[in-house]
């Protein structure tokens, strides 16, 4: 009844304030879109996030909201504005009938509207606690002290702040935005309400079992006593953090989001904005034994997304489900039977499992790294997390076959020293989404804003592809792969590196149509070759042609099939030196690899020739991998000959700068 009165009050105000003179027609040619969660049970119809165009001011947001209310009232509908967003995303949260969506989409400034949906704690079963004796043996795990310069925000359930693990380390903010618990007979028990958040706070910064014992934390309550929240509540929480950051700028900020919901454009957009404001966001990949790209905030590229492994480096199984996987996961971390603070008593401990626990580990490691090097950018931190991870230790057989190549085989680890690795040239591999099977389908892989795209390759499980090319898009290079007729689709694979003061460009040679093959080199003074790509318009390059090998003494040259256009990535950066390494075999083989020596970093990976039995090339850590069709389907003719071409670089400039600092 109280709520209805509130609605009526707002409705009257809206009617009074609406003036026809304020009416602004939506811009022509731009249509706002409607989005909702793909997982039906998680939908929350009746509540909508109306996202306005980027430049929209707060006053315009308020005016648009009032306008919606007035126009709805004229049609006899009650609406309630629950929140007006500003600081992170312009827009508002409105409670209204779905009948009004068409009207709302036509309002001025509207970019898109998203129906609210649920998000969930990612520990399973996080409330079925296995209590360990209160006198927990602290000597079992002694992580290094650290993280004292960093503040970690935890968006989770309520927490038991007087638990001895976290007492004095966690500040409980007054932020709370949670949905009602499900079920009429739900009994709120403090220890259950606090269970998930308390455990995670302990994993991040607990006295005995914490990763970053020096880190201070702030908790925001966005999950209810059943571990359930909403996208809108999470958005308002992220906005709260941004406003806090603006009011009182502190040192580095890490935001831990140990929750997941269905794919959400608006939640991903909010994460992107916060990340671009210098905040490091770490999230759970999700516990659905599924592609992490189908969930948010796990699918947001700017967020560090963490899957879970166990003590045997196996992906974590959780009942019939388990850790998510795929290209949207950045790395894995321990997430099974993790000992941490239990909300059952102030000295109790419990083990919990899930990608929430894995994400908490990485948030702790991030806090340690940022405390040692507070100036690290998000891109630098992510590259370091990848660099210091244990490589290729996860048994990939657990993942679906089509996801194995896309899922990073990395388990997070603390760096051996807190002095960082400033001398290192850091690179990572970024896979695109699958292109789809249509003839002209393409896939695009992008690097983060402050990374350089140093090379581009492609991969197709059927082998039917038309190569790849680097091209400019919005002032930045992207990697685009092309599907071929009859192909099941392609992936683009970008090699993204941290290269300060770099000036990179792409040099292209059209198909040569000569028996020598196509060649292109870096002709500008001081520019070195960091990657080679090839792209062809013909459906099949022809399998009878032998691979074209690079002439000796021409290290700055890309070579390829005569019917392909060849693209060379050429970069100038202080002290950058690169060399080409080739490994060719005369007989057919499913996999050919070549790796860079210690101290060198793989920047480019490509295959010669680009013929259809070659599925593609991609970089795994410092190894260039070329995959070909199953040996049994390829005769042992020269058709089987394949060469893996790696370009290995290092930066003398970075090495010198690092030595000067020591």
């Amino acid at each position: 009844q109280e709520d209805e009165d509130g609605d009526y009050e707002e409705l009257v105000l809206a009617l009074r304030s609406e003036e026809d003179g304020l009416a602004e027609a939506p811009e022509h040619g731009t249509t706002a879109t409607f989005h909702r969660c793909a997982k039906d049970p998680w939908r929350l119809p009746g509540t909508y996030v109306v996202v306005l165009k980027e430049e929209t001011h707060l006053s315009q947001s308020e005016r648009t909201a009032r306008r919606l209310q007035a126009q709805a009232a004229r049609r006899g509908y009650l609406t309630k504005i629950l929140h007006v967003f500003h600081g992170l995303l312009p827009g508002f949260l409105v409670k209204m009938s779905g009948d009004l969506l068409e009207l709302a989409l036509k309002l001025p400034h509207v970019d898109y509207i998203e129906e609210d949906s649920s998000v969930f704690a990612q520990s399973i079963p996080w409330n079925l606690e296995r209590i360990t004796p209160p006198r927990y043996r602290a000597d079992e795990y002694q992580p290094p002290d650290g993280g004292s310069l960093v503040e970690v925000y935890l968006l989770d359930t309520s927490i038991q702040s007087d638990h001895r693990e976290i007492e004095g380390r966690v500040m409980v903010t007054d932020f709370e935005n949670v949905p009602e618990e499900d079920g009429t007979r739900f009994h709120r028990q403090a220890s259950k309400c606090d269970s998930h958040g308390t455990h995670l706070a302990g994993v991040v910064s607990g006295r005995d079992a914490g990763v970053a014992k020096g880190a201070s934390m702030r908790s925001l309550r966005v999950l209810n006593c059943q571990g359930k929240g909403t996208v809108s509540g999470t958005l308002i929480g992220l906005e709260f953090i941004r406003k806090s950051q603006l009011v009182q700028p502190v040192g580095p900020l890490v935001v831990l989001l140990p929750l997941a919901g269905g794919y959400s454009r608006v939640l991903n957009a909010a994460c992107q904005r916060l990340a671009r404001a210098g905040v490091v966001l770490v999230t759970a990949a999700g516990n659905f034994r599924d592609d992490a790209c189908l969930y948010s905030p796990a699918s947001a590229p700017e967020v560090i997304t963490v899957g879970a492994t166990n003590a045997q480096d196996q992906p974590v199984t959780l009942g019939t489900l388990g850790t998510n996987f795929g290209r949207c996961v950045d790395l894995f971390a321990p997430g099974e039977d993790i000992i941490g603070a239990s909300s059952d008593c102030s000295t109790c401990f419990v083990s919990q499992s899930g990608t929430s626990q894995a994400a908490a580990h990485v948030a702790g490691i991030a806090a340690m790294m940022l405390s040692a090097e507070p100036e690290l950018t998000l891109a630098e931190l992510r590259q370091r997390l990848i660099h210091f991870s244990a490589k290729d230790v996860i048994n990939e057989a657990w993942f679906p076959e089509d996801q194995r190549v896309l899922t990073p085989n990395l388990v997070a680890a603390l760096p051996p020293s807190t002095h960082g690795a400033g001398w290192q040239l850091f690179c990572r591999t970024v896979w695109s989404a699958h292109s789809g099977p249509t003839r002209m389908a393409t896939a695009v892989a992008r690097c983060a804003p402050d990374e350089e795209l140093l090379s581009c390759s492609s991969f197709s499980r059927s082998g039917k592809r038309r190569g790849e090319r680097m091209e400019a898009q919005g002032g930045k290079l992207v990697c685009r792969a092309h599907n071929a007729f009859g192909g099941e689709g392609v992936y683009a694979i970008a090699r993204c590196c941290l290269l300060p003061q770099a000036n990179c460009s792409v040099h292209t040679a059209p198909p040569a149509e000569a028996s020598m093959g196509t060649r292109v080199h870096c002709h500008q003074q001081g520019h070195v070759l960091t990657g080679c790509s090839s792209h062809w318009e013909v459906e099949d390059l022809g399998t009878h042609k032998p691979p074209v090998l690079r002439p000796r003494g021409q290290p700055n040259q890309c070579v390829g099939h005569r019917e392909a256009s060849i693209h060379a990535s050429c970069c100038h950066a202080p002290g950058l030196e690169c060399k080409v390494k080739e490994h060719g075999i005369p007989a057919p083989q499913e996999q050919v690899t070549v790796a860079c020596e210690e101290g060198w970093t793989l920047t480019g990976c490509s295959a010669l020739p680009g013929t259809s039995h070659v599925l593609g090339a991609y970089a795994v850590d410092n190894t260039c991998v070329v995959r070909s069709r199953d040996v049994s389907t390829t005769g042992s003719t020269s058709e089987g000959a394949v060469t893996a071409v790696a370009i290995c670089c290092r930066s003398r400039h970075l090495a010198q700068a690092s030595q000067e600092l020591q």
Epitope: K391, D392, E396, R404, K581, H583, I585, Q589, E590, Q591, V592, T593, V594, A595, C596, E597, E598, V620, D621, N622, T623, V625, A644
Partner: nanobody, 123 residues
Amino acid sequence: QVKLEESGGGLVQAGGSLRLSCAASGLTFSNYAMGWFRQAPGTEREFVGQISQVDGFTYYEDSVKGRFTISRDNAKNTVYLQMNSLKPDDTAVYYCAAALAFPTTSSNTYAYSGQGTQVTVSS
């Protein structure tokens, strides 16, 4: 200081099995394809098999295919050679080696090699 240390060799009867291990230190183990070679008295060093850096792809010399299996544990920086259905012809010193490329059968393409472990198969 790179070190490759083989173990697990010994005397075994024909038809028997043996598992050799090779523990690596001083290198970025996951960066290297790991191979096994063997050398019988008075003969050249012979390629046995190799496991790649990525996805555990393997490549074997024809005479050991189906009998020998190479595996690796990157968490332990160790590579293994499981030898089944051993024959007297398999008697040799077995060496583990690290290469930056896969597949490669020539010992001079390997950057590092161990001291070897003796395997003797009696008839």
